[in-house]
Interface confidence: medium
């Protein structure tokens, strides 16, 4: 029986019924409930929340809701031996110490188990030495220091400002530069928007606020001790020395009050240009070491955190499909937070909760989706996407055969200006069509569609009259589904105005001040932006699970493949002489893209014309659409990154948060002029072009007529 026969309701009515059932007031209530105490991964509080969500999803009407547990490597500060940084004089006396905790926000003074700021997975150590200021600690910042300024970071403690790139990349870069410790701090230039008060009077970061976060370089591995396989009861675990992605030097985060004390004494070289200056009243000298009067003083780190194998719990809910129960559409977001999780993740978890409630209401009225919908509340995302990755490792065979799509649901807001969507090109048309049907919540756009306000506020840089949609990078739970398994994925949230607000993320990210009140007072008092995000995420899941033909347009992949090929060719053409010397040609890639474009066009024509009442042909066409994303997976993975297997997209090697197109070719070309063996380096470029061209051609052939 089809889902529509089961209810005698038209598909359009079902979608309307689903969307109409979503209520801002419920999201608000759920957010409040999820944010009253900390829910740090591996703690009893987070286990209790998992059980609460399991119970409520069952009440909402899902067919089954199970806990999936894993024993993974986590990291915690030592409760009796706190982490801090000091300035020491020549006698070794500590003349300044950084704060041991953030001053708690009003109303939370008596809350226990607030984890103090720390860099998760930092090794223990007490290095001391001269300080070097390394700006954002990006690849290009170290190039500037080492190549242009001839400053050697070897044996130094580096201080870097948060922002621009994932903190794990900063630590990796510092390690490669020979540093013996890293201090991370939030500069007001990046975390204090002009004209806004600091919390609790506004949404800016106070001087005592600190960003927590993991500093791993997992490259998609999941649990550091069980890469590739689930961390279950009978798992074989690597020794800590063989663990994946752990940093080798101590790392600690601080706020800008403490950073001021370290940076104001800096001597040595002046900053190379204005892009190295933040907003503190300090010279932003690079060092090494302190200036004149303070030249005998050093910086000392005291880090005593421990890595511990700890049990984590995912909640997995199932709403069985009526027609294609073996096809899975997944909506997942994490539950664990650093402290209260007012935005990250509970603004997302509250939206998922309301989406589950709405689907459950329809199910209780006799409706079922065409395909199975899986709902997930992931654990230990903050410790390296561990819950989602372990579950996907455990279920990889099912997922690679049955996974239609994954929609991510972390923070629903990072601002309140306009929509932000990152997704596979297969979902562009789905997102466009859906947002044309939804009302904009934005002031000045009353009665207008979400598509209209989004396009006006965030226009595509390429296509007039269309909104910007970005590439998927990483740093969130879609990673394993998209980058490793090749399941079409997308994410949506409300964002800030990127033109006027240059600060990184939102100011209170991963601090103790990320509370319910932050959201309710300053970001979304009416919860109208949360509701819109619920409609977008929920609407995408609904369409993916219920449309007779999957709402994927392969022609949009053809368009971006051409753009990405143009881009990578243009990068390579910065080296015309070497291209000639080593006979480097992109002809095979452009040819494959041309073939893909033609075959995708023909497939789309067949998709319009085929007999949709023939279930075998329908299933065949849908399978070609479902498996197209899978066809971009190279089983061997990218060089030195075996769990990043998507040939078209991978997280940037220089910033995990950003997506890179044709990453294999891009990395082979990166800084190629500095390679010791140019012949070998250009040989690798040629190999990567070959892999990319083959993959695009092979993917195209999956869309050809089957016989």
């Amino acid at each position: 029986k089809s889902s529509n026969e089961a209810t005698n309701i038209t598909p359009k009515h079902n979608m309307k019924a689903f969307l109409d059932e979503l209520k801002a007031e419920n999201i608000k209530k759920f957010l409040y409930n999820f944010t009253q105490i900390p829910h740090l991964a591996g703690t009893e509080q987070n286990f209790q929340l998992a059980k609460q969500i399991q119970s409520q999803w069952k009440e909402f009407g899902l067919d089954s809701v199970e806990l999936a547990h894993y024993d993974v490597l986590l990291s915690y500060p030592n409760k009796t031996h706190p982490n801090y940084i000091s300035i020491i004089n020549e006698d070794g006396n500590e003349i300044f110490n950084t704060s041991l905790f953030e001053p708690p926000p009003p109303g939370y003074e008596n809350v226990s188990d607030i984890v103090p700021p720390f860099s998760a997975f930092s090794p223990q150590g007490m290095p001391e030495g001269d300080l070097v200021y390394v700006n954002y600690a990006r690849t290009e910042d170290f190039f500037k220091l080492e190549r242009d300024m001839k400053i050697n970071c070897s044996g130094k403690i580096v201080i870097a400002r948060y922002g621009k790139v994932f903190r794990g990349n900063k630590v990796k870069n510092a390690q490669l530069a020979g540093a013996k410790g890293v201090i991370l701090y939030s500069d007001p230039a990046d975390y204090f928007a002009p004209g806004v008060k600091s919390y609790p009077d506004g949404w800016n970061l106070p001087g005592g606020g600190v960003q927590r976060g993991n500093i791993l370089n997992l490259n998609g591995a999941g649990d550091p001790l069980t890469p590739g396989y689930p961390a279950n009861e009978y798992a074989y675990r690597r020794g800590i020395a063989e663990a994946v992605g752990l940093p080798s030097i101590p790392v600690h985060p601080i706020g800008y009050y403490d950073a001021q004390k370290l940076l104001e004494k800096m001597g040595g070289s002046a900053p190379p240009d204005s892009s190295w200056r933040g907003s503190l009243k300090v010279p932003y000298n690079v060092g090494p070491g302190f200036t004149g009067n303070f030249s005998t003083q050093k910086v000392k780190m005291h880090i005593h955190s421990t890595n511990e194998v700890t049990r984590i719990y995912n909640v997995i809910g199932t709403l069985r499909g009526a027609v294609e129960p073996d096809r899975y559409v997944i909506l997942g977001g994490h539950r664990d937070s650093w402290v209260f999780g007012g935005i990250d993740p509970q603004s997302g978890a509250a939206v998922v909760h309301e989406i589950v409630r709405s689907f459950g209401t329809l199910k209780k009225e006799g409706w079922r989706p065409r395909r199975t919908i899986l709902f997930a509340s992931w654990d230990a995302e903050e410790f390296g996407l561990l819950g989602s990755t372990e579950w996907a490792e455990e279920n990889s065979r099912l997922l690679q055969e049955r996974g239609v799509a994954y929609i991510n649901a972390d923070s629903s807001i990072e601002g309140n200006y306009t929509l932000r969507v990152d997704c596979t090109p297969l979902m562009y048309s789905l997102v466009h069509n859906l947002t044309k049907e939804l009302k904009s919540p934005d002031e000045g756009f009353e009665g207008k569609s979400l598509y209209e306000s989004w396009t006006k506020k965030s226009p595509s840089p390429e296509f007039s009259g269309m909104p910007r949609i970005s590439k998927l990078g990483s740093g969130n739970d879609f990673e394993v589904f998209f980058q490793r398994l090749g399941i079409a994925s997308g994410r949506a949230r409300y964002t800030k105005n990127w033109e006027t607000n240059k600060f990184s993320g939102y100011p209170l990210y991963h601090s103790v001040y990320e509370t319910y009140e932050l959201v309710e007072k300053f970001y979304d008092p009416m919860f109208k932006y949360h509701l819109t995000v619920a409609q977008v995420r929920g609407g995408m899941v609904f369409e993916l699970a219920n449309s007779i033909v999957l709402p994927f347009d392969c022609r949009d992949y053809a368009v971006v493949l051409r753009k990405y090929a143009d881009k990578i060719y243009s990068i390579s053409m910065k080296h015309p002489q070497e291209m000639k010397t080593y006979s480097v040609s992109f002809d095979s890639l452009f040819s494959a893209v041309k073939n893909f474009t033609e075959i995708a066009s023909k497939f789309s024509e067949r998709l319009q014309d085929f007999d949709k009442s023939n279930p075998i042909v329908l299933r065949m066409m849908n399978d070609q659409l479902m498996f197209l994303e899978r066809a971009f997976i190279d089983p061997l993975g990218l060089p030195d990154r075996p769990f990043y297997r998507h040939v078209i997209y991978a997280p940037s090697s220089h910033n995990k948060y950003a997506g890179e197109s044709f990453p294999g070719i891009y990395d082979a070309l990166f800084d190629i002029e500095s390679k010791v063996d140019p012949s070998k380096a250009w040989g690798e470029v040629k190999r990567q072009i070959y892999v990319a061209a083959f993959t695009v051609q092979a993917a195209a052939e999956t869309l050809s007529e089957v016989a």
């Epitope: 932000r420 840089p461 970005s470 964002t495 990127w498 243009s570 990068i571 997506g659």
Partner: nanobody
């Protein structure tokens, strides 16, 4: 750090041609993956996209302005230019040059230059 600076006359007579140049410093204009664009903002209004030139040379214009606008690039000088003919008082605005790309952090804008169309 890439910076953009607009230059050109602040006053243009009606029916004449508005000419602006954007000088890019701190990075190459032929850098792959970027779109070099012109936008304008009328007093009290939203930004209006005029057009852009993609790193591979393709040029796209706002359809409502297409008949009056030419965007060109001079890679040797690391500059790109805007010419808008048959201007009227309705073209009075602050004109900005900008760099854009596929991702959110790619957006950069110059400080803007006020162009008044008046006789």
């Amino acid at each position: 750090q890439v910076q953009l600076q607009e230059s050109g006359p602040g006053l243009v007579k009606p029916s004449q041609t508005l000419s602006l140049t954007c000088t890019v410093s701190g990075g190459s204009i032929s850098n792959s993956g970027y779109y070099w664009s012109w936008v304008r903002q009328h007093p009290g209004k939203d930004l209006e996209w005029i057009g852009f030139i993609y790193y591979n040379g393709s040029i796209h214009y706002n359809p409502s302005l297409k008949s009056r606008v030419i965007i060109s690039v001079d890679t040797s000088k690391n500059q790109f230019s805007l010419k808008m003919n048959s201007v009227t008082a309705a073209d009075t605005a602050v004109y900005y040059c900008a760099r854009d790309g596929d991702d959110y952090g790619d957006y950069l804008r110059g400080q803007g230059t006020l162009v008044t169309v008046s006789s």
